[in-house]
């Protein structure tokens, strides 16, 4: 499919001008290559009329120009003094006319309306309001006032001052007679339809002395604004319909076959399933304007979109509307990244978020898409060191691997973490990506004690058991804080006995805290990584308490997972309590349960082989 994009249809009137914008991917080659505008012949060729290399055909001499805007990836063709002979099929393109890097444009030039003398022309947008003013003389002040519409050869009564209203105009028309001083009546028509266009006649009086005034009403269908966005990128539709519809329900719909327009999202809470997790409707300003953001653009998102206002929250005849034609460029600069990441309850995920590598200094954000209200994505973590309170100890945003990608790690997963998350920056707003976290059946791969109590001044050893599938990974311990997870020294204690059916490649890696201080209290993670790519993590909360009896602490899985408040008094161990205050998330569902059952290979955060767009918590 050609990545060139422009208007499919351009309509104008004899004597007028048109400006046609064509879009192209702004690669270095494309920016500098030849741009052209050519007319398609009956036998399939395309004859150049104007090009960026200076050629102008005799047909266009003195009335056309072509301007390239390489920084935007667009070029514009302006044609003036249009005649009906200019109607036809054209191409705007790059390179050689026959190469296929082009877009087909149909230009239709029509004859101007043949208007009677003294005709007032009213040009109004679809869905808006028109006021037709009708002057009259004093002798007709007390006589009947009326408005007719010319249908074929016959005038048809639309409204009159005796109270008649044509059924086609019911509920949207009124006739106002100005105060006695002004010899003027006016007809106001709301929610204009395309079918309202035509010739009208105002009349005051019914005899030969009546006053008459001709009016020509032109109802304009909004020309779609062309929008050119990259595959996997995002688009923002800004919809400003005016303060008169500030309190009316708003919608964005996508035109399907014929006149149908399927609601994508509206302010009444409707949202199309295809856009779940990747659309946000920003609330309206006081003037009624609003915007809709769609991210994770797909090929099938291309098409014509309308925004409008109607009490039903969908397109109806007479809705004021704005239109866009969205083209999704498949030659995208935005890299592929998994759209689905899977993890198990108690386990973890590592999400890779792409950003524009030119903006490495921008602030990175990760937020939770909220489906209940159309416009919210509350921040969970940023690259500046802010973490939402409920996520302390289990969420971290890392600038690694860098060079256009950052990593978000979320552990201690529960079913409540399933949902859609957005990666954002405060830089290029087109780089917003969505990832869905799914919680699947299985056990966490890494085994750590539930939570641990250390004693001031003593030594604490905390184990982390890694199954053999991670034999080739780097294993680490780190202390979590709101700016990341600071690496700590750890000891490889040899093969782990926590896994049945696992060979000598399983590993027990311990964290040792010597001479424990109050500052050692907090969250500790053990995890695996390959270079700058992070895999699974497991979290342990270490509480610190006063010395009660001498001895160092060596925490085992079984001992540390004793039931809350259970006394564990074997030699070398002290009481281990689940301290709800220090570990605010120890609900039964959320506690990362460590056990010694056989680890099925599908139990880790996994990659579905069926989808190149899915990533597991420990994949790259």
């Amino acid at each position: 499919k050609s990545p060139i994009f422009g208007p499919e249809e351009v309509n104008s009137v004899e004597g007028n001008s048109v400006s046609i914008t064509c879009y192209y991917p702004p690669t270095s080659v494309n920016r500098h290559t030849r741009k052209y505008w050519c007319r398609q012949g009956a036998r399939g060729g395309c004859i150049t009329l104007i090009s960026s290399e200076g050629y102008v055909s005799s047909k266009y001499a003195g009335r056309a120009n072509l301007t390239n805007f390489p920084e935007n990836g667009t070029f514009v063709v302006n044609i003036a003094q249009l005649s009906q002979d200019d109607s036809g099929r054209y191409k705007c393109g790059l390179g050689i006319n026959s190469r296929g890097l082009s877009f087909d444009v149909s230009l239709e030039v029509s004859q101007g309306p043949g208007l009677l003398n003294d005709t007032k022309v009213y040009t109004v947008d679809l869905g808006r309001t028109v006021t037709i003013n009708c002057p009259f003389k004093t002798e007709n002040a007390q006589k009947r006032k009326s408005l007719y519409k010319q249908i074929g050869l016959y005038p048809v009564l639309v409204i009159d001052s005796s109270g008649y209203v044509n059924p086609n105009y019911t509920g949207r028309i009124r006739l106002d007679i100005q105060g006695t001083g002004q010899l003027l009546f006016s007809v106001v028509i709301n929610q204009l339809r395309l079918s309202d266009a035509g010739q009208y006649l105002c009349q005051a009086g019914d005899d030969s002395n009546s006053n008459k005034k001709n009016a020509d009403l032109q109802v304009l269908k909004p020309e779609p604004e062309l929008v050119y966005e990259d595959l996997r990128g995002s688009v923002t539709f800004h919809c400003a319909l005016g303060p008169e519809v500030a309190n009316v329900a708003k919608f964005l719909c996508r035109q399907s076959s014929g006149e149908n327009c399927d609601v994508v999202v509206n302010t009444l809470g409707k949202r199309a399933p295809a856009f779940e997790g990747r659309i946000l409707l920003n609330p309206q300003d006081k003037d009624g304007s609003f915007s809709v953001v769609i991210t994770g653009l797909r090929k099938e998102d291309a098409g014509r979109y309308l925004c409008g206002a109607h009490s039903d929250g969908q397109l109806q005849e007479g809705s004021p509307i704005q239109a866009w034609q969205l083209f999704v460029n498949e030659e995208s600069t935005i890299p592929r990244s998994p759209t689905v990441v899977k993890g198990v309850a108690g386990g973890s995920v590592a999400v890779l978020c792409p950003y524009n590598r030119k903006e490495s200094k921008s602030i990175k954000y990760w937020c939770l898409w909220e489906g209940a209200q159309n416009g919210r994505c509350p921040l969970l973590v940023d690259s500046e060191g802010w973490v939402k309170a409920q996520y302390e100890g289990r969420l971290s945003l890392l600038e690694e691997p860098g060079n256009g990608t950052f990593t978000v790690i979320l552990n201690q997963l529960t079913s409540r973490d399933a949902g859609f998350y957005w990666c954002l920056t405060n830089g290029d707003t087109l780089w917003r990506t969505t990832v869905e976290i799914k919680i699947i059946e299985g056990e966490p791969n890494l085994k750590v004690p539930g939570n641990v109590t250390a004693v001031l001044g003593e030594t604490l050893k905390v184990p982390c058991h890694f199954p053999c599938k991670f034999s080739s990974y780097e294993k680490y311990w780190c202390k979590w804080n709101n700016t990341g997870c600071q690496a700590l020294p750890s000891q490889d204690e040899g093969p782990s006995k926590a896994f049945v059916n696992c060979d000598e490649n399983s590993r027990l890696v311990s964290l040792t805290l010597n001479l424990v201080t109050r500052a050692d209290e907090g969250w500790y993670w053990c995890g695996v990584k390959q270079g700058h790519f992070y895999g699974e993590t497991a979290a342990v909360y270490v509480a610190v308490e006063e010395r009660k009896a001498a001895g160092s602490r060596d925490v085992s899985l079984a001992k540390a997972d004793a039931a809350p408040d259970e006394k564990v008094l074997d030699s070398g161990f002290r009481e281990i309590e689940n301290k709800a205050i220090q570990d605010p998330r120890l609900f039964a569902e959320e506690k990362a349960v460590a056990d010694t059952r056989d680890q099925a290979d599908g139990s880790r955060a996994s990659v579905d082989s069926g989808s190149s767009e899915e990533q597991g918590g420990s994949s790259r």
Epitope: C377, W386, A389
Partner: nanobody, 131 residues
Framework: EVQLVESGGGLVQAGGSLRLSCAAS????????MGWFRQAPGQEREFVAA????????YYADSVKGRFTISRDNAKNTVYLQMNSLEPGDTANYYC????????????????????????WGQGTQVTVSS
């Protein structure tokens, strides 16, 4: 809701120093940025300094750079403004402000210097610098 109470204002000679404090209470876990703004009689309220509540990144108006320092104590939910080399032009009512974490997409584009981004405001404390 977050409540903010400023203190530390007063009368000081040009060239002198003052330290303003702003204590936050209520739902302080929702705070994202805290900032100081000032308003002189007949003037619009203007940005002075701001601090990111998580990592502590700071932002300053050009007019106070090198003279004023903003800092925070998360444990005490307090933000400070240390004002040195004070000038008569610094005379104003100083207001402390707090901003909630972003929720709407437009929030992510807002800058700490923008007055409209702040959700909560203190009553203000008067600083008068005499020449």
């Amino acid at each position: 809701e977050v409540q903010l109470v400023e203190s530390g204002g007063g009368l000081v000679q040009a060239g002198g120093s003052l330290r303003l404090s702003c204590a936050a209470s209520g739902r302080t876990s929702s705070i994202y940025n805290m900032g100081w703004f000032r308003q002189a009689p007949g003037q619009e309220r203007e940005f002075v300094a701001a601090i990111h509540w998580g990592g502590g990144r700071t932002y300053y108006a050009d007019s106070v750079k090198g003279r004023f320092t903003i800092s925070r104590d998360n444990a005490k939910n307090t933000v400070y403004l240390q004002m040195n080399s004070l000038e008569p032009g610094d005379t104003a009512n100083y207001y402390c402000a707090a901003r909630r974490a972003p929720e709407l997409l437009d929030d992510y584009k807002q800058k700490p210097e923008e007055i409209g981004t702040y959700h909560y405001w203190g009553q203000g404390t008067q600083v008068t610098v005499s020449s």
